[in-house]
């Protein structure tokens, strides 16, 4: 037989199918020009010493073969003895290691069998009513196709599915969508309405994430507040990676889960912008404010469940950093300025009340005064910190107040509002004899003592009503008792107590009269 013709003789090997798992498969035959045809196939198993024979049986029952040698592709013309206008049955027999291996048969009309391409280029994936919709441009000159898909998960083998007939410039397929695992899809096409036409190769993998992105399991820690009034948020545990099917491992566009960090600054609600979203991994600096931090996972189908943490405010106070002067027109606070053109946010709330009751005020960008201080003033009429109670004050600063991650804490401290000098006056002053020339003076703690760092000291004043001599005794803010000694019997005295802050002198308590009785000896 001539090599270009189909040989109508018995093939040069015994006729027996070994039934082994290896061997030829995926036979495809089609017309490639007006008078030429091509068949190609895959061979699974060791290829050394394998000879391939393309077998063909005509409708008359006569059969022939082409010897392909070690090649897995063979071309022939319409003059090769194979009927191209009538149905023929083709298969491959591979002779190896003294045994024959057979491919599945294909029955087709060669002249009408056109080589179909799988979906090429961009396959768009979307979600439609709980299913997966894939869409692609129909390859040129190939309108009219049957389409199949196969899909697998990381733990399951390929499953075959049917997309149905297609007859347009774009083709599409509805496929099952998994809730919690990634899938790999491949598509193939063949000519519509051409009996027994060959399937195209499978397309490149289409990698599809689960409908629900995995919930991020991450842990954060926040550093201590530095001198710059900032603390770095650090990621202690990276999110777990999604398990992928075999063909999606490595580069798998489509299955990516993106994790984003959403910061919500709870403190200083009067600023312009309260939330900011960053890529996870971009660990920002935070001020000492309270924040809610959410990690949001999302894939091409949208966001999934998020995980939220609360980062409490840093409550470390700097009692000396803030100067407060109280005048007839109002109150002014002074603190060391950070820079020129800084915006400050002053936040205050009554101590012991819910954080949601904080009030704040945003300053216009301000430069330091000649002493290098920044200031904030308010009038009595404004009602700010007007009640006679303890307030917790925090001052934040930013050169770029519109950027959430550029706020820093300047200071946190306590302040007693209203008329602190009068409100702080100690009550229930009592005098008890202590010895022949001394008394013990006690008083109830000043309201200022409820405000950490505000009460600087008590001062006890003793006045000799005869000589009009006055002595003053400073007392530690933690004490509410003092012993006055060197007193004379029979003399009338008055005693008063006041409570002083660092910036304000207190109001004396009501005078308390006492005297030490003269002791008469028997």
């Amino acid at each position: 037989c001539r090599t270009s013709e189909c040989c109508f003789q018995d093939p040069p090997y015994p006729d027996a199918d070994s039934g082994s798992a290896s061997g030829p498969r995926d036979l495809r035959c089609y017309r490639i020009s007006s008078d030429r045809y091509e068949c190609s196939w895959q061979y699974e198993g060791p290829t050394a010493g394998v000879s391939h024979f393309l077998r063909c049986c005509l409708s008359s029952g006569r059969c022939c073969y082409f010897a392909a040698g070690s090649a897995t592709r063979l071309q022939f013309s319409d003059q090769a003895g194979v009927s191209v206008l009538y149905t023929v049955t083709l298969w491959v027999e591979s002779w190896a290691r003294n045994q024959t291996e057979k491919s599945p048969e294909v029955t087709l009309q060669l002249y009408n069998s056109v080589k179909y391409e799988p979906p090429l280029g961009d396959i768009k994936v979307s979600k439609l009513a709980g299913q997966l919709r894939m869409e692609w441009e129909t390859p040129d000159n190939q309108v009219g196709a049957e389409v199949q898909f196969r899909h697998r998960t990381p733990s399951s083998p390929w499953k075959l599915g049917d997309c149905g007939p297609q007859d347009d410039d774009t083709e599409s397929c509805l496929c099952p969508l998994e809730m919690n695992v990634a899938q790999e899809f491949q598509l193939r096409r063949r000519q519509l309405g051409s009996q027994g036409s060959s399937w195209s190769k499978w397309s490149s993998p289409v990698c599809v994430p689960p409908e629900n992105p995995p919930q991020p399991q991450v842990r954060f820690s926040v550093e201590q507040l530095g001198q710059d009034g900032r603390r770095r948020l650090t990621l202690k545990e990276q999110p777990t990676q999604l398990e992928l099917p075999e063909g999606c491992q490595g580069l798998a566009p489509g299955t990516e889960v993106t994790y984003r960090l959403q910061l919500h600054m709870l403190s200083c609600p009067c600023k312009a912008k309260a939330t900011r979203t960053l890529h996870l991994g971009k660990m920002p600096y935070l001020s000492g404010a309270a924040y809610n931090v959410a990690v949001i996972s999302s894939n091409q189908f949208g966001p999934g469940l998020n995980q939220t943490w609360h980062i409490p405010a840093d409550t470390h106070t700097e009692p000396v950093a803030l100067n407060i002067s109280v005048g007839t027109n109002g109150t002014t606070m002074y603190w060391p300025a950070r820079a020129q053109s800084m915006t400050y946010c002053i936040e205050w709330q009554p101590v012991g009340q819910d954080g949601g009751l904080a009030t704040c005020s945003l300053t216009a960008p301000q430069d330091p005064d000649p002493a290098g201080m920044a200031t904030y003033s308010w009038s009595r009429e404004s009602g700010a910190m007007g009640q006679e109670k303890c307030y917790y004050i925090t001052i934040f600063a930013s050169a770029h107040p519109e950027k959430l991650t550029l706020w820093s804490t300047v200071l946190s401290t306590y302040h007693f509002g209203g008329n602190a000098s009068a409100a702080g006056t100690p009550h229930h002053v009592s005098v008890k004899n202590h010895s022949l020339d001394s008394v013990s003076v006690d008083w109830a703690p000043s309201l200022l003592s409820t405000c950490p760092g505000v009460l600087k000291e008590y001062v006890v004043r003793c006045r000799d009503e005869d000589s009009k001599q006055v002595s003053e005794h400073p007392v530690q803010p933690t004490e509410t008792q003092v012993t006055l000694s060197g007193l004379r019997a029979g003399v009338a005295y008055t005693v008063q107590v006041r409570a002083d802050t660092a910036w304000l002198r207190g109001v004396w308590s009501q005078p308390q009269r006492f005297s030490i009785e003269v002791q008469v000896s028997d």
Partner: nanobody, 124 residues
Framework: EVQLVESGGGLVQPGGSLRLSCAAS????????IGWFRQAPGKEREGVSC????????WYADSVKGRFTISRDNAKNTVYLQMHSLKPEDTAVYYC?????????????????WGQGTQVTVSS
């Protein structure tokens, strides 16, 4: 005016040394974590070294560890980068910026202030 001004760059032979300075004006440097970044031609900007505001703790990129030293003089409102054993791959424009991140990123991070940069060229 608030600004950071770098100086001290120049041309130096491999194995040589340079000391870069970053002077702050218009703001008090000791309130800020500050650091150096660099950008070589055609490459991403990368973090080189950082120094914190409070405990003066420092961070260095692996490529410069043992060769570069960062320090600050708050009285002079200046941060320094002492560079020894310079290599051709250290050639870049060096910038200082605050706050300092170990992984400079103009998109993902935000900065209070940054300078205009000083050119360092290491070549024989």
């Amino acid at each position: 005016e608030v600004q950071l001004v770098e100086s001290g760059g120049g041309l130096v032979q491999p194995g040589g040394s340079l000391r870069l300075s970053c002077a702050a004006s218009g703001f008090t440097l000791d309130y800020y974590a500050i650091g150096w970044f660099r950008q070589a031609p055609g490459k991403e900007r990368e973090g080189v070294s950082c120094i914190s505001s409070s405990d003066r703790s420092t961070w260095y990129a692996d490529s410069v560890k043992g060769r570069f030293t960062i320090s600050r003089d708050n009285a002079k409102n200046t941060v320094y980068l002492q560079m020894h054993s310079l290599k051709p791959e250290d050639t870049a424009v060096y910038y200082c910026a605050t706050p300092c991140y170990s992984d400079y990123d103009p998109e993902g991070y935000e900065y209070d202030y940054w300078g205009q940069g000083t050119q360092v060229t290491v070549s024989s």
